[in-house]
């Protein structure tokens, strides 16, 4: 192979100019002609100076994997995927996400200690004694010792999930 400069690529025993980002080689250079470069078609891209005969396929962000498109594909840059709302990343690929999972739902008797982010799941915590959370979505557990005003006495101690009325 010939020793080509950084902005050239080898063709047989010769060096041809690379095409710019967003273009691929339609025809290699000749003695009197430069490289003929052709723009990448929609849905394809090349992100660097290159000697490629075909542009690369843009990645698809699969909603079934909990993904959404955070940056659309352009002819010079691949699409970037992020997590759909209510999801966090479980497989990181460089600076973007390859797969996401839905946030955990706190069970009854638990409170949301920390809401989920794009990189972290929801953190749940059991309600302390004497408090309850009936649906697991509350950030604070509620005190469960107060009886309804038409009841004179407490019927039972209650649990962290439900209170007796």
């Amino acid at each position: 192979l010939p020793s080509c400069k950084e902005d050239e690529y080898p063709v047989g025993s010769e060096c041809c100019p690379k095409c710019g980002p967003g273009f691929h080689v339609r025809q290699a250079c000749g003695e009197q002609t430069g490289t003929v470069c052709e723009p990448c078609s929609p849905g394809t891209y090349i992100a660097h100076f290159n000697g490629l005969s075909k542009c690369l396929q843009c990645q698809m962000c699969d909603p079934a994997m909990g993904l959404r498109t955070s940056r659309n594909c352009s002819t010079t840059a691949n699409a970037l995927c992020g997590c759909s709302p209510g999801h966090f990343c479980i497989i990181q690929d460089g600076d973007h996400c390859a797969a996401c999972r839905a946030y955990a739902t706190s069970s009854p008797g638990q409170r949301v200690q920390k809401g989920g982010t794009e990189s972290q799941d929801t953190l749940c915590q059991n309600c302390p004694p004497g408090t309850f959370s009936s649906n697991g979505t509350l950030e604070e557990c509620q005190h469960g010792t107060k009886c309804s005003k038409w009841l004179v006495t407490e019927a039972g101690p209650g649990t962290s999930s439900f209170r007796w009325v």
């Epitope: 100019p17 690379k18 980002p21 430069g34 470069c37 992100a47 100076f49 840059a77």
Partner: antibody, heavy 113, light 106 residues
């Protein structure tokens, strides 16, 4: 041997136009893109624009309205024209092949009355 | 446009010391390019396509990174490496340079 050499006026009065020529040798302008980059004294590099082998141009959006890049393949020359110069356009102006494999030595342009 | 922030702005290193400087992009870029410039000289291409060494560049230089975070490393500092280093992205128009890192010898 690949070479690029810029030639410019040196001194330009405020509000006037600037024309710089980049003369290249050792490669054909039909194949390679040429960039224009400038550097104010003591400051960093600023990309101005580029003309590709096929004649297409791309510009720095902040300067696009004032810039024009063209070339003459047969004379191996690339031209930079910039309008309405102000004192903060004082800089060394460089031409470079594609992504900077080769650079000219630059030409210093001073904008002053 | 994509803003490239280089850090530190100025640093110094002793001969033989390992040096790392970073280039942070305001949004994701596909590749990074690094240039070296000495006072009174034109810039010189050091690294292309993030990690490829340009011809004639000593192997003590290396580049790495992806997305928004890139770095240039000199494995063992030499006196001749004292210069200003610039990163540049070619992923998105306009092609922008970083503000530069000035590397001094101790």
């Amino acid at each position: 041997q690949v070479q690029l050499k810029e030639s410019g006026p040196g001194l330009v009065a405020p509000s006037q136009s600037l024309s710089i020529t980049c003369t290249v040798s050792g490669f054909s302008l039909t194949g390679y893109g040429v960039n224009w980059v400038r550097q104010p004294p003591g400051k960093g590099l600023e990309w101005l624009g580029m003309i590709w082998g096929d004649g297409n141009t791309d510009y720095n959006s902040a300067l696009k309205s004032r810039l024009s890049i063209s070339k003459d393949n047969s004379k191996s020359q690339v031209f930079l024209k910039m309008n309405s110069l102000q004192t903060d356009d004082t800089a060394r102006y460089y031409c470079a092949r594609s992504y900077g494999s080769y650079w000219g030595q630059g030409t210093l342009v001073t904008v002053s009355a | 446009q994509i803003v490239l922030t280089q850090s530190p702005a100025i640093m110094s290193a002793s001969p033989g010391e390992k040096v790392t400087m970073t280039c942070s992009a305001s949004s994701s870029v596909s590749y990074m390019y690094w240039y070296q410039q000495k006072p009174g000289s034109s810039p010189r291409l050091l690294i292309y396509d993030t990690s490829n060494l340009a011809s004639g560049v000593p192997v003590r230089f290396s580049g790495s990174g992806s997305g928004t975070s890139y770095s240039l490393t000199i494995s063992r500092m030499e006196a001749e490496d004292a210069a200003t280093y610039y990163c540049q992205q070619w992923s998105s128009y306009p092609f922008t340079f970083g503000s530069g890192t000035k590397l001094e010898i101790k």
